[in-house]
Interface confidence: medium
């Protein structure tokens, strides 16, 4: 896992190699300058987009070589005891449902990318966060309602999935489902008044100042 120094370094993508090269070049040219990561990412992204297939080729070769290295090293790598069990994720297990904010992002990310093709991933995420914060609670409702329904479905699915796996796990699943319903009631956030008490937002949804659910 995180702490195993013997674990092979993860494989790098062609774009990651390109960014690494950019960084090295920048360091050579400006050894003492501190890097504005957001600006730097933006510039790299813009440059990558304008590069020809031929120019990108060298980085793709580097990525291919690194992939081969990673696969080779992983064949001989023995993870520490207990890690394999912990790390295993059943591909048949129900997927965690997306939050309202995530659903909102899925809808608006392509629009932002279309309007601002040069924006880095970080800047797109920042813009999405700002947009969500400035969205009135009534406009958030379709995402919240869909997220609530997906969450409900997930809780049923995960309880059924656990029941199939272990007889006593079903009970755990039901308890967990009830608990998360209670959590939802305790965190009825963003719906009505802006209040003196600070609201706790669910998961990765950004905090928002709003006045009601209408």
């Amino acid at each position: 896992g995180k702490g195993d120094p013997k674990k092979p370094r993860g494989k790098m993508s062609s774009y990651a190699f390109f960014v690494q090269t950019c960084r090295e070049e920048h360091k050579k040219k400006h050894p003492d300058a501190s890097v504005n990561f957001s600006e730097f990412s933006k510039k790299c992204s813009e440059r990558w987009k304008t590069m020809s297939a031929k120019e990108k080729g060298k980085f793709e070769d580097m990525a291919k070589a690194d992939k081969a290295r990673y696969e080779r090293e992983m064949k001989t790598y023995i993870p520490p005891k207990g890690e394999t069990k912990k790390k295993f994720k059943d591909p048949n297990a129900p997927k965690r449902p997306p939050s309202a904010f995530f659903l909102f992002c899925s809808e608006y990310r392509p629009k932002i990318k279309g309007e601002h093709p040069g924006l880095s991933i970080g800047d797109v995420a920042k813009k999405l966060g700002e947009m969500w914060n400035n969205t009135a609670a009534d406009d958030k409702q379709p995402y919240e309602k869909k997220a609530a329904k997906l969450k409900e479905k997930y809780e049923k699915d995960i309880a059924a999935y656990r029941a199939k796996g272990k007889p006593d796990a079903a009970k755990k699943g039901v308890v967990k489902a009830e608990k998360s319903k209670k959590k939802k009631e305790e965190e009825e956030d963003e719906e009505d008044e802006e209040d003196e008490e600070e609201e706790e937002d669910e998961e990765d949804e950004e905090e928002e100042e709003d006045d009601d659910d209408e």
Partner: antibody, heavy 125, light 108 residues
Framework: AVQLVESGGGLVQPKESLKISCAAS????????MYWVRQAPGKGLEWVAR??????????YYADSVKGRFTISRDDSKSMVYLQMDNLKTEDTAMYYC????????????????WGQGVMVTVSS | YELIQPPSASVTPGNTVSITCSGD??????AYWYQQKPDKSIVRVIY???ERPSGISDRFSGSSSGTTATLTIRDTQAEDEADYYC???????????FGGGTKLTVLG
């Protein structure tokens, strides 16, 4: 306890103006959006106007039937919300309710649920 | 955008009655239900499709499926006689929408 008290209703002639008021107490007024809802005699409820809070630039919204004639405003320092009604028509005759969102048991809940007792506005020649 | 409710419904004491509310946006929007008694006082009985505010009898329940929201009152009492309005938000107007209201009569 939360209270919303409307005042200023009465009998006016068509094309005249009237301003109704709503005094709020018992909750943090500056943090709540405020609404006016009306009910014509023997008819259903109709949303008239909404005003949001300072962080939301006091944004206002109106029902199509009153757009351009009615103006909602608020005074956070006095916990008051107003509805200025100009160029009144006979079809504006109704009981006007001042309403606000509410919090239940420390949980933010949904739906407008503080209602005043209403004030009657009659437009007739 | 409209929310359609039946104008009237009737029930005998002790029985269950359901009032429906239909609207194209209801799959995406929450439904809220209000009770207006003959004295004109207004109380919210259901919010967010199926949540019941504190102080509201558990005889009142709400559900929503597709374009229809439903308010159900079981073991109906004489004091439940009132007008019931559904409401939903609608982002284009930035103002909510009310249904036309359903007059519930408790017979007997």
């Amino acid at each position: 306890a939360v209270q919303l008290v409307e005042s200023g209703g009465g009998l006016v002639q068509p094309k005249e103006s009237l301003k109704i008021s709503c005094a709020a107490s018992g909750f943090t007024f500056s943090n709540a959006a405020m609404y006016w809802v009306r009910q014509a005699p023997g008819k259903g409820l109709e949303w008239v106007a909404r005003i949001r809070t300072k962080p939301n630039n006091y944004a206002t919204y109106y029902a199509d039937s009153v757009k351009g004639r009615f103006t909602i405003s608020r005074d956070d320092s006095k916990s008051m919300v107003y509805l200025q009604m100009d160029n009144l028509k006979t079809e504006d005759t109704a009981m006007y309710y001042c309403t606000a969102p509410r919090r239940t048991e420390g949980i933010v809940s949904s739906g407008v649920d503080y209602w005043g007792q209403g004030v009657m506005v009659t437009v007739s020649s | 955008y409209e929310l359609i409710q039946p104008p009237s419904a009737s029930v005998t004491p002790g029985n269950t009655v359901s009032i429906t509310c239909s609207g194209d946006e209801l799959p995406k929007r929450y439904a809220y239900w209000y009770q207006q008694k003959p004295d004109k006082s207004i109380v919210r009985v259901i919010y967010k499709d199926s949540e019941r505010p504190s102080g509201i009898s558990d005889r009142f329940s709400g559900s929503s499926s597709g374009t229809t929201a439903t308010l159900t009152i079981r073991d109906t009492q004489a004091e439940d006689e009132a007008d019931y309005y559904c409401h939903s938000t609608y982002s284009d107007d930035k103002l909510p929408v009310f249904g036309g209201g359903t007059k519930l009569t408790v017979l007997g």
